[in-house]
C-alpha cells in the first residue's frame, strides 16, 4: 500500500479534526491501516489512535478527537500499515478550519415586505470562532436551483434581511447558508440545511 | 544550553514601525513554536501571538491583529517581530519565548521598544 | 477571554516560612487530562522564568522547595521554606483558551 500524495486535514476547531487520503490500490482501511496522533511540543502527551474508514475503495477518512483547541496546538500524525509507516507529519487545527455547518435556518416574515432569514452558528461565546465567522446565504429558485442570488454576511449577527420583491412571486425558493472563519486559515462549512417557502407578494397596479 | 537572545532596546518615534529580532541557540529551532509576549511598565504579561519556525503558521492575539506581524528566518534560526503604527502605547518590553505544550519554557533576554517624539 | 485572578497582590514571609499564592480561573482550565496552568517567577529587570507546568510538574532545575496544586479553577502555588532569593513576582498564566493569559501578579518580599 502506498499513500498518494499528502493526507488533506481539516478541524472543526471545536472537537473534531478529518484527515482523508489517497490510496494506489483498494483497501479496507479500518483493518488494514490506523492512524496515531498525539499533541506535540511535550514528551508526555497521550499517543492517540484514529481507526480510518472507507469513503471510497482507495480512500480513507479518519475523525480524530480534539477537543477544544487552540491556535498553538499542533499534532504529530503517523499512519501505519501494520507495522510500516506509511506516512508522517504533523497537523495544526488552526491552519485548516473548516466550521461546523449552521443549524436551524429560518424564515420570518418582516415588516415593510421584508423577508428575515436566521440561523444558529455552532460555536460557544469561549471559542475563538464565536465572534469570528462570516457566513453566505444561497436563495434558489426551487424548481431551478441555476437561478439564484448569494449574499455575502460579513457582520457577526446571525442573520439576514431582504426585500420580498426581490425575488420573483408566486415561487418556490429554497434558502441554506455556509460559514467560514475570517482570522483563522480554512475552507467554506458545509452548507446547512435547507429551507423552502413560497414567495407571494400582491404586485403594484401598475404591474397587474 | 537553550537560549533566546534578543535585540536591543529601540526609540521609534509615533507611527513609525519596529522590527525586533530572536535568534535561537541550543536546540533544533523548527521543532518548537516560538511566542511574543509583552509586557507594560509594571504590568503583567500579555500573549501577542505565535509562529511555527517550520512552516511559518501563525496566530495572534486579537488584540495585537494588525499591529504585529511575526516571521522567521530558518537559516539563521532567527524570529522577528514586527510592530507598525506605534503609539505610546506601545512603549514595553517585549519577549520571545520557546513554546512548550501550552506553556513557555525558556524566555528571551527582552527587547525595549519606548515610543516618544 | 479567561481571567486570571491572583491573591494577594503582595505578601511578606518571613525566612524559612511557607508562601501561599492562589490563582482563580474565571472558567476550568482542564482539557486533555492536564489542567493547562503553569506558573513563573520574574525578577526585576529579568524575564519571566518558569517554575510550575500543568499545575503541579516541578521545571527541570526548579528546587523542590516550590510546588504547585489544584484543578479547573483553583490552583496554588506554594514555597517551603522560603529563601532570600525568592523576593520576586509570581505570575500564573493558562492556555486553555485562546487567547493566553496571565495574572496580575504577586509580589513576594522576604522578611
Known amino acids: 500500500i502506498k499513500v498518494l500524495g499528502e493526507p488533506t486535514c481539516f478541524s472543526d476547531y471545536i472537537r473534531t479534526s478529518t484527515c482523508e487520503w489517497f490510496l494506489d490500490s483498494a483497501v479496507d482501511c479500518s483493518s488494514q491501516l490506523c492512524l496515531h496522533y498525539r499533541l506535540m511540543f511535550f514528551e508526555f502527551s497521550e499517543n492517540l489512535t484514529c481507526i480510518p474508514r472507507n469513503s471510497a475503495s482507495t480512500v480513507c477518512v479518519c475523525h480524530m478527537e480534539m477537543n477544544r483547541p487552540v491556535q498553538s496546538d499542533r499534532y504529530q500524525m503517523e499512519l501505519w500499515a501494520e507495522h510500516r509507516q506509511l506516512w508522517q507529519g504533523s497537523f495544526s487545527p488552526s491552519g485548516n478550519v473548516k466550521p461546523l455547518a449552521p443549524d436551524n435556518l429560518t424564515l420570518h416574515t418582516n415588516v415593510s415586505d421584508e423577508w428575515l432569514l436566521t440561523w444558529n452558528n455552532l460555536y460557544p461565546s469561549n471559542n475563538l470562532l464565536y465572534k469570528d465567522l462570516i457566513s453566505m446565504v444561497n436563495i434558489s429558485r426551487e424548481d431551478n436551483p441555476a437561478e439564484f442570488i448569494v449574499y455575502n454576511v460579513t457582520y457577526k449577527e446571525p442573520r439576514l434581511s431582504f426585500p420580498i420583491n426581490i425575488l420573483m412571486s408566486g415561487v418556490y425558493y429554497t434558502a441554506r447558508v455556509r460559514v467560514r472563519s475570517q482570522i483563522l486559515t480554512g475552507t467554506w462549512s458545509e452548507w446547512s440545511p435547507s429551507i423552502t417557502w413560497y414567495n407571494h407578494f400582491q404586485l403594484p397596479l401598475i404591474q397587474r | 544550553e537553550v537560549q533566546l537572545q534578543q535585540s536591543g532596546p529601540e526609540l521609534v518615534k509615533p507611527g513609525a514601525s519596529v522590527r525586533m529580532s530572536c535568534k535561537a541557540s541550543?536546540?533544533?529551532?523548527?521543532?518548537?513554536?516560538i511566542h511574543w509576549v509583552k509586557q507594560s511598565h509594571g504590568k503583567s504579561l500579555e500573549w501577542i501571538g505565535y509562529i511555527y519556525p517550520n512552516n511559518g503558521d501563525n496566530g495572534y492575539n486579537q488584540k495585537f491583529r494588525g499591529k504585529a506581524t511575526l516571521t522567521v528566518d530558518k537559516s539563521s534560526s532567527t524570529a522577528y517581530m514586527e510592530l507598525r503604527s506605534l503609539t505610546s502605547d506601545d512603549s514595553a518590553v517585549y519577549y520571545c519565548a520557546r513554546g512548550r505544550l501550552r506553556y513557555f519554557d525558556v524566555w528571551g533576554t527582552g527587547t525595549t521598544v519606548t515610543v516618544s517624539s | 477571554n479567561i481571567v486570571l485572578t491572583q491573591s494577594p497582590a503582595s505578601l511578606a514571609v518571613s525566612l524559612g516560612q511557607r508562601a501561599t499564592i492562589s490563582c482563580r480561573a474565571s472558567e476550568s482550565v482542564d482539557n486533555y487530562g492536564h489542567s493547562f496552568m503553569h506558573w513563573y517567577q520574574q525578577k526585576p529587570g529579568q524575564p519571566p522564568k518558569l517554575l510550575i507546568y500543568l499545575a503541579s510538574n516541578l521545571e527541570s532545575g526548579v528546587p523542590a522547595r516550590f510546588s504547585g496544586s489544584g484543578s479547573r479553577t483553583d490552583f496554588t502555588l506554594t514555597l517551603d521554606p522560603v529563601e532570600a532569593d525568592d523576593a520576586a513576582t509570581y505570575y500564573c498564566?493558562?492556555?486553555?483558551?485562546?487567547?493566553?493569559?496571565f495574572g496580575s501578579g504577586t509580589k513576594l518580599e522576604i522578611k
Open positions: 498564566q493558562q492556555y486553555n483558551e485562546d487567547p493566553p493569559t
Open positions: 541550543g536546540y533544533t529551532f523548527t521543532d518548537y513554536n
